[in-house]
Interface confidence: low
């Protein structure tokens, strides 16, 4: 049998502490009681806790735990959120600069192409931005569309300026001829390779960062089980029931309880480690043609070279296209 | 080769960025992020210990609470959890992770597989033209100056001139992060309940 409480024992200290949790005092016994209805803080002797107090302690313990978890992840969460925003904006800046570089190249070297070239370049880089942000656009199609659009303008403005401005009928034929005759040589394929490699790595990098945020958010807002709530209550609050207000949990005991409460969360560890190491590997490989900054900022130069290639072969091309698109041109001149 | 179109920018910020030599590049920012992330590589396995060290536990006291009674800090009883008749800690562990945790583990598995695939020199990724041959040969110099393109006029070197942090608004250091003290920051009385 547990010893009875001393005759002068009261629950005054317990009451004043509990008042901070729950303003209503009616749940705290005046003097220690047997506590036979308790389910968590099983008494070894008289207790200053009631069933209602136990329930309140459990709720508070779980809230404490959630708050501790959020506090623990705050720095990591901020690091990833901040960097995801930085890189997303940085990549958009690169795209904007690349577009400016390309437009400037047209303006300096091919002023006669500028109005239309600016439009096609703008559409291409809009697609690049959308692709990085996750749109299901095919990079090859983007590049093909750029060169398909550019070639009729190059043909009518640079190679064959005698054609009427309203050469819409010939445009379709020229678009087809562009691919069939490989008028830009290997440059479209080169750009496809470089752009697809660099952009794919860029968007998987961004996706990985966004998933990192999702992982932290998920574990940040975990609701702990009732069993965990009971364990935490035992550790943090059951000592109060015996009037032990200043005593703290044993370190080893705390670790055991936390491992029990967080067994599910700790299962993420293996995949989290792998995530960081895999991300490191990806980042280490983001150079040369896997670095979108490098690739996109050099595109203006490659596009310039591709137009020079067309100009070098202009004589031969004009003859071939003249025959190939003759029907369209005749309709034009009528 | 193409005239370098540096002087055509109207955007003053762009001009500013193009000529700053010692700001961070995108690649250095990426590497810096990885280094910081690597310091969190044990984040999840260390969580139980972290939370114990940031909640009240007996450190210098002779006596501590083991869930049932007051015991000496170094006694065998101190490590016991005092839950024998109530619920089994082992059972709690055996329940496995919550569905949301399982889902996030699945997503991590997928992203890890993607990251590994992309990191391979011949990453077997399904997007078109990701591994076309013949465009990577030749020595292109260091990370800052890379070969782009190439034609009869020879390879063109393009200097990575953009220095991004000069332009970005996000220049907070992690140390400046709000509430970064690592301590539990009480929101109200309902939550702040530790009694010391």
């Amino acid at each position: 049998q547990p010893p009875p409480p001393p005759p002068d024992a009261t629950c005054h200290q317990v009451r004043s502490f509990f008042q901070r949790l729950q303003p209503g005092l009616k749940w705290v016994p005046e003097t220690p009681v047997p506590g036979s209805d308790l389910q968590v803080c099983l008494p070894k002797g008289p207790t200053c806790c009631s069933r209602k107090m136990e329930e309140k302690y459990q709720l508070t313990a779980r809230l404490n735990m959630e708050q501790l978890l959020q506090s623990a992840s705050m720095e990591l969460k901020f690091l990833i959120i901040q960097n995801a925003a930085v890189f997303q904006e940085a990549f958009e800046i690169v795209v904007r600069h690349a577009k400016n570089y390309t437009n400037a190249m047209f303006k300096n070297n091919y002023p006669s192409l500028t109005p239309q070239a600016f439009e096609f370049v703008g559409e291409f880089f809009t697609d690049v931005s959308l692709y990085i942000l996750g749109s299901d656009i095919n990079v090859d199609d983007m590049v093909n569309e750029l060169f398909d659009s550019l070639f009729p303008v190059i043909y009518t403005q640079l190679m064959n300026p005698g054609l009427p401005d309203s050469a819409l009928d010939i445009n379709e034929c020229l678009r087809g001829a562009r691919r069939d005759l490989k008028v830009f040589g290997n440059f479209p394929k080169l750009i496809m390779t470089q752009v697809s490699k660099s952009l794919q790595v860029t968007r998987i990098f961004l996706q990985a960062l966004n998933l990192g945020i999702e992982v932290i958010n998920t574990t940040d807002h975990l609701k702990f089980s009732k069993d965990c709530g009971r364990m935490l209550t035992r550790m943090w609050y059951c000592s109060y029931c015996q009037g032990l207000m200043m005593v703290k949990p044993c370190g080893g005991y705390c670790n055991v309880v936390m491992q029990g409460c967080m067994a599910g969360v700790v299962e993420i560890d293996k995949y989290w480690r792998e995530y960081i190491l895999s991300l490191e590997e990806l980042v280490n490989g983001m150079y040369r043609i896997y670095d979108m900054e490098n690739v996109l900022l050099g595109l203006f130069s490659t596009i310039h070279d591709s137009i020079q290639y067309v100009q070098k072969n202009a004589g031969k091309l004009t003859t071939t296209i003249g025959k190939l698109c003759a029907h369209s041109q005749q309709r034009q001149y009528r | 080769s193409a005239y370098y179109p540096e002087d055509l920018f109207i955007d003053k910020k762009v001009l500013k960025v193009a000529h700053v030599e010692h700001e961070e590049t995108l690649s250095s920012r990426r590497r810096e992020l990885i280094q910081k992330l690597k310091s969190f590589i044990s984040f999840y396995s260390a969580l139980p210990g972290y939370i114990c060290s940031h909640s009240p536990v007996a450190e210098n006291d002779t006596l501590c609470w083991n869930g049932q009674e007051l015991v000496e800090r170094y006694s065998q009883k101190a490590a016991r959890n005092g839950m024998k008749n109530q619920f089994n800690l082992h059972e709690l562990k055996m329940k496995g992770p919550e569905p949301v945790v399982s889902q996030i583990i699945d997503k991590l598995k997928h992203i890890n597989q993607l990251l590994r695939t992309m990191s391979m020199p011949k990453g077997r990724v399904l997007d078109k033209n990701l591994d076309e041959e013949g465009f990577e040969s030749g020595d292109c110099g260091d990370d800052e100056d890379e070969c782009i393109g190439g034609s009869g006029d020879g390879m063109i070197k393009v200097k990575n001139q953009l220095r991004f942090l000069a332009e970005l608004a996000y220049d907070l250091d992690v140390d400046d992060a709000p509430g970064n003290s690592q301590q539990a920051t009480p929101k109200d009385n309902e939550i702040s309940t530790f009694h010391n």
């Epitope: 090859d140 996706q207 792998e274 | 695939t117 033209n129 591994d131």
Partner: antibody, heavy 126, light 106 residues
Framework: EVQLVESGGGLVQPGGSLRLSCAAS????????MSWVRQAPGKGLEWVSA????????YYADSVKGRFTISRDNSKNTLYLQMNSLRAEDTAVYYC???????????????????WGQGTTVTVSS | QSVLTQPPSVSGAPGQRVTISCTGS?????VHWYQQLPGRAPKLLIY???NRPSGVPDRFSGSNSGTSASLAITGLQAEDEADYYC??????????FGGGTKLTVL
Amino acid sequence: EVQLVESGGGLVQPGGSLRLSCAASGFTFKDYAMSWVRQAPGKGLEWVSALSGSGGATYYADSVKGRFTISRDNSKNTLYLQMNSLRAEDTAVYYCAKEMDFRYGWMHYYYGMDVWGQGTTVTVSS
Amino acid sequence: QSVLTQPPSVSGAPGQRVTISCTGSSSGYDVHWYQQLPGRAPKLLIYGSNNRPSGVPDRFSGSNSGTSASLAITGLQAEDEADYYCQSYDSSLNAIFGGGTKLTVL
């Protein structure tokens, strides 16, 4: 209906060559990676080679490296396996298989082989 | 190249539950399972460790833990008698198959 039909198998002498074809229908061929898998008489499955959707990336098992060449013609929806310097141990039923396209968000990656042909038999014997 | 190891044979009576193990998947890639009925081409049974393509009965299920995976068949039926293969990718992303397991329905 998604379908793969192999052809080109037959009897060939050791050291000889053979070209297998696999005609695909019912799906957008260029969007999917393809593999060749073989099965020797009474034995298990052995992966031989794979090729990305664009044809840019090729993969070979060690046992066939340098002797077999995988290729595709996306305009004809056809996968090929050129087999040179054939050996007796290359005798098998050769299956072509479509790699499953598993999308995670907007990315693709390999996730098993979800469509198989009926197989074509290659016998290497003198 | 990596190796996936399966038991050569397993057997069970109709209605019973059988499992087939597959060990050695160290690359971290998921394991996929194929069924090959006698004289037929293989058929994808389970992908991504525990997903069933449409048309595959829910009697078939997969699980994965660390370097091993397993295929479980509950309510065994005579038509389940076949060869079963596990498949994954090695670190070079080459496909690898297990040696195959012959399932006999007693």
